[in-house]
């Protein structure tokens, strides 16, 4: 007998659906109505038959109070190869809904996503999280799809993009944007962040992650930063190969006073880098390779700083004297 | 055992340039910043500065930005104490004491742990 | 910069009585505050950093204390080896560091 594609937990909270069989029943999926997050997986299937089963033109509005009803907040749909015209059906249908947070991960988006109408209402969502979702309309997806959605976007994550940089001057400005994660973007490097990073679309950016987008150096992240006019208070630069020193014919960058958190941990750093901002909140430099503690010009002032991970501090790797104060910890690095 | 002893000290006139040495033993010199402090007699310490032994970069007091030069000559493990144009309140003894840096989730800072004996400097005509 | 003001300049102290000196620093400086003591003619040693914490080998009997602007120390059963000046320093993060006035223990 093969396993039930959907299970539905004990509280009626959480629905994983996992439809690996060539002809799913979708209907199945009727048993998450009742979940607050719901979780739909195709196994790689073409969506492409779908569209001749459903009216993608069809009103929505027909449906607003059983969408409304839906319990579902948070939805993650992987794994397939949707239509552009299914995709915004679904979100033409979902903008009725109570849904909040959106996740698509390993989805191949063909065709084009037609304009709003302008009867519709766009997709309230707090969240969009996109992974390794690849898009036919290519450089200007963002923009196709920021126009189903409602202007209070307050997170977005882009992972695995394979045209991580935007068509700018079609993007509208996020204005609730707050928190914006291009981590795992390992082509991105700092001239693809400049291009990614639309001046002024995102102007209430408060975190910005960052971690294993193909930074150099930190400076260089400043450049990019100062050029988009962002100005975060908490940057996540983890998982990068940095160097620490600068190019000594490179401009000096002056970071934002917003900034207040930076991350630099698991960087590969040698030394502490130069040019970090004169006063932080929150530094992370545990799991680097520094090999000797820092001196008092080579930190910046910082209320909150991890070490923790790097060989001057493990027992064994440095001989700090008996008087120095360890942390005692040694973190799986 | 870690070690620092200062030389170059004594009885100079008023005017002269004087160089007071700083000679480290028992671990790495580059590792760990360097320190000058100035006692006057009967008196209190006085943080004169401090310089960075991976680039020799110097850092002076607000009292020490004129007449007061430190460096470094890495491959003998010293550092420096310059002072030029010596007056009567130059007279005290002088200290070089290492920055020894301590680290224990999240605090951290500086303390000078190792100091040097000292070296007494008599500016008199 | 930051000044820090000692309080007494000196103490006349029997052994094995208790001792508290006060440091008082001119803006908050957190926990950054480092106490060293001073024998005659010999160079300062460290006891106390980061306000509280004991120095390698040093006994027990010296304590500190305080945050933001007021600083204590004590020796809480005073020695004859004691007597000696005691200063404390403001070790800020980051530069410059400034030593208080220092306060000398006598014997009574």
């Known amino acids: 007998t093969t396993p039930e594609p959907c299970e539905l937990d004990d509280e009626d909270f959480r629905c994983v659906c996992n439809f690996s069989e060539p002809q799913p029943d979708w209907s199945e999926a009727f048993q998450c109505v009742s979940a607050v997050e719901v979780e739909i997986h195709a196994g790689g299937l073409n969506l492409e038959p779908f569209l001749k089963r459903v009216d993608a033109d069809a009103d929505p509005r027909q449906y607003a109070d059983t969408v409304k009803a839906l319990r579902v907040r948070r939805l993650t749909v992987g794994a397939a190869q949707v239509p552009a015209q299914l995709l915004v059906g679904a979100l033409r249908v979902l903008a009725y809904s109570r849904l909040k947070e959106l996740t698509l991960e390993d989805l191949k988006i063909t065709g084009t996503m037609p304009p709003l109408p302008l009867e519709a209402t766009g997709l309230a969502l707090s969240s969009l999280r996109l992974r390794n979702v690849s898009w036919a309309t290519g450089r200007s997806w963002l923009a196709e799809l920021q126009q189903w959605l409602k202007p209070g976007l307050k997170v977005l994550s882009i992972a695995q993009a394979h045209s991580p940089a935007f068509s700018c001057e079609q993007v509208r400005a996020f204005p609730a944007l707050t928190s914006l994660d291009l981590s795992d973007n390992p082509g991105l490097g700092e001239r693809g962040l400049m291009a990614a990073l639309c001046p002024h679309k995102f102007p209430a950016i408060q975190n910005l992650a960052l971690r294993n987008t193909g930074m150099e150096t930190p400076t260089g992240v400043c450049a990019a930063l100062a050029a988009a006019g962002v100005q975060p208070h908490s940057l996540d630069l983890s998982h990068n190969s940095l160097r620490a020193t600068v190019n000594p014919s490179a401009p000096r960058c002056m970071w934002s006073s917003a900034l207040n958190s930076l991350n630099l941990s698991f960087a590969g750093l040698e030394q502490v880098p130069k040019g970090l901002p004169a006063k932080l909140r929150v530094l992370d430099l545990s799991c680097n390779r520094l090999n000797r503690a820092p001196q008092p010009d080579e930190l910046p002032e910082v209320d909150n700083l991890t070490l923790d991970g790097n060989p001057f501090l493990v027992p064994g790797t440095a001989l700090p004297h008996e008087g120095s104060m360890n942390s005692g910890v040694v973190p799986a690095c | 055992e870690v070690k620092l002893l200062e030389s170059g000290g004594g009885l100079v006139q008023p005017s002269q340039t004087l160089s007071i040495s700083c000679k480290a033993s028992?671990?790495?010199?580059?590792?760990?910043?360097m320190n000058w402090v100035k006692q006057a007699p009967g008196d209190g310490l006085k943080w004169m500065g401090w310089?960075?032994?991976?680039?020799?970069?110097?850092t002076y007091a607000d009292d020490f930005k004129q007449r007061f030069v430190f460096s470094l000559e890495t491959s003998a493990s010293t550092a420096y104490l310059q002072i030029n144009n010596l007056n009567i309140e130059d007279t005290a003894t002088y200290f070089c004491?290492?920055?020894?840096?301590?680290?224990?989730?999240?605090?951290?800072?500086?303390?000078?742990?190792?100091w040097g004996p000292g070296t007494m400097v008599t500016v008199s005509s | 910069y930051i000044v820090m003001t000692q309080t007494p300049t000196s103490i006349s102290i029997s052994v094995g009585e208790r001792v508290t000196m006060n440091c008082k620093a001119s803006?908050?400086?957190?926990?950054?505050v480092d106490w060293y003591q001073q024998k005659t003619g010999q160079s300062p040693k460290l006891l106390i950093y980061?306000?509280?914490n004991r120095y390698t080998g040093v006994p027990d009997r010296f304590t500190g204390s305080g945050s933001g602007t007021d600083f204590t120390f004590t020796i809480s059963n005073m020695q004859a080896v004691d007597l000696a000046v005691y200063y404390c320093?403001?070790?800020?993060?980051?530069?410059?560091?400034?030593f208080g006035g220092g306060t000398k223990l006598e014997l009574k």
């Open positions: 980061k306000a509280s």
């Open positions: 004491t290492r920055s020894t840096f301590y680290y224990s989730s999240y605090i951290y800072g500086w303390y000078f742990d190792f």
């Open positions: 320093m403001q070790s800020n993060t980051n530069p410059p560091w400034t």
């Open positions: 310089i960075n032994t991976q680039t020799g970069k110097p």
């Open positions: 803006q908050n400086v957190g926990s950054n």
């Open positions: 028992g671990y790495t010199f580059t590792d760990y910043a």
